[in-house]
Structures are given as structure tokens and as C-alpha cells.
């Protein structure tokens, strides 16, 4: 059956060394757990993380997200899953793609993540 | 298994404030956006704002512009509502409700509602 | 704002009835649309999302369908616990908004 893939229509924002969500949904919902789920950098398709068969790839990953990430599957099956990042880091600024893949149909969408330096803060003062 | 818990009943009078609290539990409070909807006695539903408690920013229904402001603590994974300048007319359940992670998504969790009755 | 009327207001009907509630949009709101049980005291409950999508934990025989302006909420066969008031809601623009209410009471 077809779906649409949807996400969040704003950045995600998250500060460095904190952790950072990104939801992705598809509609109508529908059971996902026998799909393939994933996200990749949208510049060069790094895979950030996959799952597939019902297991986390985590071979498949990019060097740079091993280890740092999550899949919370706990809503799989309504077609509801987050990518937790944890540790972000500056390089993970930019944009994001989930994909869900049913046999060989396949849905994506496009989200943000924004990443901020807790301790940076400019005295406009000082800006001449 | 998430859960909002809010404060209790409130009476009050015309022309002062009230300030209701949903405390969140069960969910990475910060990523989901927090809506208040109001129900007067007999009415139907009617959604008064929303916020995303990660940018902290607060949308609001015109018709509450300038009287209702939301917030939320992330500290305390606690949003509140205060509407001020109260009326007989804003004698009503109030609820606050969770959409999943963003805005324009339905209201999945609810919290048990506060009884707001404005009376001189 | 997209203003939801449902029809009926009241609706009266008999445990095991086939029971049929429509929500209709001022404008097209794609698929776009929950409903939501509520009894008396508690707070509102959601059956179905995206038009069509039951939520996890509610019975098979609640059911949606529609799209852009005309929606349906459809109790194939009524049971006891589904006498309550039954609200749709558009969420296809930043001010969600409310259908009336349908009250769906024993015959």
C-alpha cells in the first residue's frame, strides 16, 4: 500500500553534546516494523542509521553516527519513529532524510537539524 | 507511557488571573509540542495556543491574543497557561494536550483537565 | 480558521447499530483529520488520525475515511461503552479547530 513520509516542517534544534530527535511518521499509519526505516545526510547520502529486517544496520553506518545513535521504536507499529543522536557535535548541523521502504515502494522527507553552542554568546556591544 | 498531570480546580474573580500547570512524564518533553484546549460547561472543544517547549516560543488562537500566554519549564518537563483578565465566559475545563513531537499533528495524550470557575 | 461541522448534533441508537457521524471542512484539509471520543468528566480520547489511521489500542470497529472536505466516522456495530460525544478536528493549519460535537445516546 502507498503512505506519505512526514516530518517535522521547523529545525530541530539541539545544543552540542546534548542529545538531538528527529521524528518522522508516515500516513495513513500503519505497521512498520517489517519495513526498512532509515535516515541518511542529504548532501552525499551518508547513512546516518538503518534499520532493516527487523534489526538496526549498524554496519551500514557512516564512521562519524557509530554508536552515537538510536532508533526509538517504541510507536513502530503505528508507523511513528525518532532518530536519537547522541553527543551531537557542530558537523552534525544540516540536512537530514527519513526513508520508510515497503517491498520497493519508498517515501521520504527532508528535516533540519540545528546545532547551538550553549556557552556562545555575543555582547552586541562589542560588535562594531 | 506518557502521562500530563495537572493542577487543581481553581475559583476565581472577574478581572484577575489564573495559571494552570501540565506536568509531562514518560517522553522526551522538550521535543513534543504542548496545545491548551478549553471546554466551557455544555460546549464543544476550543484550542487557545501551543507551544514547542525546545524553541520555547508560544502560537496562539486570535481570540485569546494579548490574554493567554503559554510557557514551559524544561527543567521540570512543566507547561502552564495563564489567562488573565477573567470573565464569567471563561468558567471551563481546561486541558492541556501532547501532539506528537510538531504541531499540525493530532492530540494524542491528554491530561486529566482543571476546573477553572470564574465567579464575584 | 477552517471552521468543522458535524452532523448530527444527536444521534440515537441501539447497541449493535451501524453508526455514521460526518464532519465536513469550510475548506480542503487534505487528509488531515482525528476524532475523538469523550464521556462525561474525562478528556477527550483519540480514535483516529490522518482521516483513516485507528490508534493504537482502539477497537477495529471504529473507522474513518475521507478526504479534502467530506469525512466519515463509522461504529460498525455500537457497543455500550460507545455511548459518548464524538468530535472531529482539523490539524491542517497551526489553529486546529473543532467540529461541534456529535452525542451518540441509547435509544
Known amino acids: 500500500g502507498q503512505f506519505r513520509v512526514i516530518g517535522p516542517g521547523y529545525p530541530i534544534r539541539a545544543l552540542v553534546g546534548d542529545e538531538a530527535e528527529l521524528p518522522c511518521r508516515i500516513s495513513p499509519g500503519k505497521n512498520a516494523t517489517g519495513m526498512e526505516v532509515g535516515w541518511y545526510r542529504s548532501p552525499f547520502s551518508r547513512v546516518v542509521h538503518l534499520y532493516r529486517n527487523g534489526k538496526d544496520q549498524d554496519a551500514e553506518q557512516a564512521p562519524e553516527y557509530r554508536g552515537r545513535t538510536e532508533l526509538l521504536k517504541e510507536t513502530i507499529s503505528e508507523g511513528k519513529v525518532t532518530l536519537r543522536i547522541q553527543n551531537v557535535r557542530f558537523s552534525d548541523e544540516g540536512g537530514y532524510t527519513c526513508f520508510f521502504r515497503d517491498h520497493s515502494y519508498q517515501e521520504e522527507a527532508a528535516m533540519e537539524l540545528k546545532v547551538e553552542d550553549p556557552f556562545y554568546w555575543v555582547n552586541p556591544g562589542v560588535l562594531t | 507511557q506518557v502521562q500530563l498531570v495537572q493542577s487543581g480546580a481553581e475559583v476565581k474573580k472577574p478581572g484577575s488571573s489564573v495559571k494552570v500547570s501540565c506536568k509531562a512524564s514518560g517522553g522526551t518533553f522538550s521535543s513534543y509540542a504542548i496545545s491548551w484546549v478549553r471546554q466551557a460547561p455544555g460546549q464543544g472543544l476550543e484550542w487557545m495556543g501551543g507551544?514547542?517547549?525546545?524553541?520555547?516560543?508560544?502560537n496562539y488562537a486570535q481570540k485569546f491574543q494579548g490574554r493567554v500566554t503559554i510557557t514551559a519549564d524544561k527543567s521540570t518537563s512543566t507547561a502552564y497557561m495563564e489567562l488573565s483578565s477573567l470573565r464569567s465566559e471563561d468558567t471551563a475545563v481546561y486541558y492541556c494536550?501532547?501532539?506528537?513531537?510538531?504541531?499540525?499533528?493530532?492530540?494524542?495524550?491528554w491530561g486529566q483537565g482543571t476546573t477553572v470557575t470564574v465567579s464575584s | 480558521d477552517i471552521q468543522m461541522t458535524q452532523s448530527p448534533s444527536t444521534l440515537s441508537a441501539s447497541v449493535g447499530d451501524r453508526v455514521t457521524i460526518t464532519c465536513r471542512a469550510s475548506q480542503s484539509i487534505s487528509s488531515w483529520l482525528a476524532w475523538y471520543q469523550q464521556k462525561p468528566g474525562k478528556a477527550p480520547k483519540l480514535l483516529i488520525y490522518?482521516?483513516?489511521s485507528l490508534e493504537s489500542g482502539v477497537p477495529s470497529r471504529f473507522s474513518g475515511s475521507g478526504s479534502g472536505t467530506e469525512f466519515t466516522l463509522t461504529i460498525s456495530s455500537l457497543q455500550p461503552d460507545d455511548f459518548a460525544t464524538y468530535y472531529c478536528?482539523?490539524?491542517?493549519?497551526?489553529?486546529?479547530?473543532f467540529g461541534q460535537g456529535t452525542k451518540v445516546e441509547i435509544k
Open positions: 494536550a501532547r501532539e506528537w513531537y510538531w504541531p499540525d499533528n493530532p492530540f494524542d495524550y
Open positions: 478536528q482539523q490539524y491542517h493549519e497551526y489553529s486546529p479547530t
Open positions: 507551544i514547542i517547549p525546545i524553541f520555547g516560543t508560544a
Open positions: 490522518d482521516a483513516s
